[in-house]
Amino acid sequence: QFPRECANIEALRRGVCCPDLLPSSGPGTDPCGSSSGRGRCVAVIADSRPHSRHYPHDGKDDREAWPLRFFNRTCQCNDNFSGHNCGTCRPGWRGAACNQKILTVRRNLLDLSPEEKSHFVRALDMAKRTTHPQFVIATRRLEDILGPDGNTPQFENISVYNYFVWTHYYSVKKTFLGTGQESFGDVDFSHEGPAFLTWHRYHLLQLERDMQEMLQEPSFSLPYWNFATGKNVCDVCTDDLMGSRSNFDSTLISPNSVFSQWRVVCESLEEYDTLGTLCNSTEGGPIRRNPAGNVGRPAVQRLPEPQDVTQCLEVRVFDTPPFYSNSTDSFRNTVEGYSAPTGKYDPAVRSLHNLAHLFLNGTGGQTHLSPNDPIFVLLHTFTDAVFDEWLRRYNADISTFPLENAPIGHNRQYNMVPFWPPVTNTEMFVTAPDNLGYAYEVQWPGQEFTVSE
């Protein structure tokens, strides 16, 4: 969402979010690190190309032309500098001058040593309890953002992990059309369209970077869960990892796991959609998880097969019209899981990413809530690994990522909602080892074990 320094009346009224980096001569003297040549305050560029007709409510949603409804000027960083005030480095670069190229490695969670597994679980738990150092979240829509008195900005602090949950919620929430009117639900800025993979890639990068900073550990990397086992058990659902099943309630996590203590955010959908409020930082009930437990839907009681990954990687075209959840012969729609692994669209099919979510049969299977279950992180790192392998094989061919007429939020040059500073889908459509500073240590079915460089 927005940097804490911009969540104030003056910044919102001016539409300018260009925080100081090192304001040695008082506030406003070093916007975007300009005094040291790191960046400058410029006009925001937002995609203005047409979107598909799925969304007929132009003018009603704060997420349109993101982030122009809130801010029209932000930091543009030079060279490899990055961040809301140009105080950090672009992914894959580190050091005082951001000129040290680095590479971190994302590994299979099951391949980590006991110490590494423990460190990862502790780190997630720390992220759940640690206030995000930079960002705050809006708890009201723009028209109510200054509060009932017009003088009290409606923003809250939120933990690093809950920020990760909130950004996902905000990207999928319904469009509020007014009191007494039903909110419009056929809108999703991060699913059912070409931006699915790029959006979730940045989502993970943000969490990983936040955790690196929280831990002071530049090498920290998010592991993955290879969910394509074809099994009817969750192999990472053990108490030393993501938590086993509770003996007292089969839909809860074992009390022997720290994750049994976690409480979810963004669960009050009814309230948000009828009152027009937004999810806030208030935590509610526990994580629900019942792997393979959906007896009424046998098709989601078993995880994807290894060959499903092999097959989806043979779909050569990134996306196809109508660039939606009914696209056929689309790699994106196939890995997202609305098409069969061969690429053929079938309305009855739920495969790969979607199947893994539904298999969890609980918090992790509900779009607005799913990141509350930390398995989400592992599920999406694996999905991103498949994406990166596709980018490697097909030379990151972006030609079929539409410039226009995708669902709203999904055009190639759209700034992904609600990330800050503004970042387009294009920027994430690159091979990770060469451009984003991370690689996967992964063995694709039928191939040698490699680090994906």
Epitope: R94, Q100, L215, Q216, E217, P218
Partner: antibody, heavy 121, light 107 residues
Framework: EVQLQQSGAELVRPGALVKLSCKTS????????LHWVRQRPDQGLEWIGW????????VYDPKFQGTASLTADTSSNTVYLQLSGLTSEDTAVYFC??????????????WGQGASVIVSS | AIQMSQSPASLSASVGETVTITCRAS??????LAWYQQKQGKSPHLLVY???TLADGVPSRFSGSGSGTQYSLKISSLQTEDSGNYYC?????????FGSGTKLEIK
């Protein structure tokens, strides 16, 4: 002037616990991570862990997990290291030190004078 | 965990000479390395950070170099006050381990 002033020497019995303090001045501890380092007699330096006084987060080397505990009191700009279940192997000088995280600077830039702990019956 | 192998364990040199101490990491640490000097009975003192940047007030006869897994601290024009123990430490991944140390004696 940046200073880290550590508490005095301690003579403790095996199995007991000890709490060392490190009072800082010249900077706000909420803006830095404070690390602790151990040095046994005539041995090298061993990293124990860090605390972020701003939120109380701590990280330890696995070999000190469970025996070392770091805390901070931001009102007095003081950090503490508590060691429990002491054995003769814990006889050492313990240093508190500061990391300047500006641009992720890889260094512990200021150190306390060290506090000697002798574990003996 | 990254292991830091430091060599030599000890060395002896005369005033005016040049010595080099090396640290080898068990994995790439991307210049996340510091060098410290410790004199007998004193606290360690920062010499070099980010593998090659000299800390404030450190004489220019000290210099750090290296990349990847191999790093060096060079002391040229040795002075008597340079005697003591030298340690490297990495900050790439937790835990932030030190090298085993090098004892420098001035003849």
């Amino acid at each position: 002037e940046v200073q880290l002033q550590q508490s005095g020497a301690e003579l403790v019995r095996p199995g007991a616990l000890v709490k060392l303090s490190c009072k800082t001045s010249g900077f706000n501890i909420k803006d830095y991570f404070l690390h602790w380092v151990r040095q046994r007699p005539d041995q090298g330096l061993e990293w124990i862990g860090w605390i972020n006084p701003d939120n109380g987060n701590t990280v330890y080397d696995p070999k000190f997990q469970g025996t070392a505990s770091l805390t901070a009191d931001t009102s007095s700009n003081t950090v503490y290291l508590q060691l429990s279940g002491l054995t003769s192997e814990d006889t050492a000088v313990y240093f508190c030190t500061r990391r300047d995280y500006t641009y992720e600077k890889a260094a512990l830039d200021y150190w306390g004078q060290g506090a000697s702990v002798i574990v003996s019956s | 965990a990254i292991q830091m192998s430091q060599s030599p364990a000890s060395l002896s040199a005369s005033v005016g000479e040049t010595v080099t101490i090396t640290c080898r990491a068990s994995g790439n640490i991307y210049n996340y390395l510091a060098w410290y000097q410790q004199k007998q009975g004193k606290s360690p003192h920062l010499l070099v950070y980010d593998a090659k940047t000299l800390a404030d007030g450190v004489p220019s006869r000290f210099s750090g170099s290296g990349s990847g897994t191999q790093y060096s601290l060079k002391i040229s024009s040795l002075q008597t006050e340079d005697s003591g123990n030298y340690y490297c430490q990495h900050f790439w991944s937790l835990p932030f381990t030190f090298g085993s140390g090098t004892k420098l004696e001035i003849k």
